[in-house]
């Protein structure tokens, strides 16, 4: 039995920040769970972890230097990533693991979300030509 995960196919981080919502076919509220976000086709980089236990506060952390926060919904976890760099444009995969009560459950691999990080471009003020002199 696997949990199904839905993610947006693509998100654009215009201001170097993005909200990525992972929607699960499973209610997490009465479970001890570990939701994580992974970067790359091979999911090699664990970007952010949200650890939840119904009786305690959420724990959110990154061991890979990402600036992240997380919020829990009934059947979703939203990862808020900030201070992203252009070179962190990549595909990101949501993962969910239900640790307790048993049995252990995890998800079918999702299609992932391409996060396109747009660099901050300072737009110069348009130059208006002054009054023409004879």
């Amino acid at each position: 039995n696997k949990i199904l995960v839905k993610q947006s196919p693509m998100l654009v981080a215009y201001d170097n920040a993005v909200n990525l919502s992972c929607k699960y076919s499973y209610n997490l509220f009465s479970r001890e769970f570990r939701a994580s976000l992974h970067k790359g086709l091979d999911s090699a980089v664990e970007v952010c972890v949200v650890y939840g236990n119904y009786s305690q506060q959420l724990q959110v952390y990154s061991k890979t230097g990402f600036n992240c926060d997380g919020k829990l919904g009934n059947e979703s976890v939203t990862f808020y990533l900030q201070n992203l760099y252009v070179n962190q444009t990549d595909i990101y995969f949501c993962k969910i693991e239900v640790m307790y009560p048993p049995p252990y459950l995890d998800n079918e691999k999702s299609n992932g979300t391409i996060i396109h990080v747009k660099g901050k471009h300072l737009c110069p003020s348009p130059l208006f030509p002054g009054p023409s002199k004879p």
């Epitope: 076919s25 499973y26 997490l28 009465s30 119904y54 059947e75 009560p101 048993p102 049995p103």
Partner: antibody, heavy 116, light 107 residues
Framework: LQQSGAELVKPGASVRLSCKAS????????IHWIKLRSGQGLEWIGW????????QYNAKFKGKATLTADKSSSTVYMELTGLTSEDSAVYFC??????????????WGQGTMVTV | DIQMTQSPASLSVSVGETVTITCRTN??????LAWYQQKQGKSPQLLIY???HLVEGVPSRFSGSGSGTQYSLKITSLQSEDFGNYYC?????????FGGGTKLEIK
């Protein structure tokens, strides 16, 4: 879930009740135990997970009930010790199913009557 | 531990009538609640899980509602086979306490 037959026991004695599972993978489901005393309501005793031998007890039944299992026979056991008239009841086992993150007990044994 | 307060403890109603049984908890259980029917000498039967979801095969005259700390089981057009005891049970951590039960008698 097939439960063992009725038991008539003396005060202070112990008894072991069994709950034999069939028709599903034994190690993938939690088994709960519930007590029903005559004229009273259902009382939750605890649960046992055969996959990892995880156990949860109601604090009220710690020292009274001990849950174990035998994977080879797909059977969960509950031993009750130091029996008194208060332990005279029907004891049910029930399988916990996970409905996408919500729990319930859809499958129950027929119950075992214990008379002290 | 979560306390379950079920009411009424008993009620006597006529066939065709509608009854509502309520279950209150002392803290939010986020709809992690089930309802069971038990007839004399039989095992309990699951009617509703997740507070509102009807189990397959259970007549549609049974319905569950509620959220937070207050939940209800409603039986419309009561039939003679609906007599027996009804229990709520929470699954918000352990112990998975049952309500005290409601004895439903047919007038």
């Amino acid at each position: 879930l097939q439960q063992s037959g009725a038991e008539l026991v003396k005060p202070g004695a112990s008894v072991r009740l069994s709950c034999k599972a069939s028709g599903y993978t034994f190690t993938e489901y939690i088994i709960h135990w519930i007590k029903l005393r005559s004229g009273q309501g259902l009382e939750w005793i605890g649960w046992f997970y055969p996959g990892s031998n995880d156990i949860q007890y109601n604090a009220k039944f710690k020292g009274k009930a001990t849950l174990t299992a035998d994977k080879s026979s797909s059977t969960v056991y509950m031993e009750l010790t130091g029996l008194t008239s208060e332990d005279s009841a029907v004891y049910f086992c029930a399988r916990r199913d996970d409905f996408s993150g919500y729990d319930a007990l859809p499958y129950w044994g027929q119950g075992t009557m214990v008379t002290v | 531990d979560i306390q379950m307060t079920q009411s009424p403890a008993s009620l006597s109603v006529s066939v065709g009538e509608t009854v509502t049984i309520t279950c209150r908890t002392n803290e939010n259980i986020y709809s992690n609640l089930a309802w069971y029917q038990q007839k004399q000498g039989k095992s309990p039967q699951l009617l509703i899980y997740a507070a509102t979801h009807l189990v397959e095969g259970v007549p549609s005259r049974f319905s569950g509602s509620g959220s937070g700390t207050q939940y209800s089981l409603k039986i419309t057009s009561l039939q003679s086979e609906d007599f027996g005891n009804y229990y709520c049970q929470h699954f918000w951590g352990t112990p998975c306490t049952f309500g005290g039960g409601t004895k439903l008698e047919i007038k």
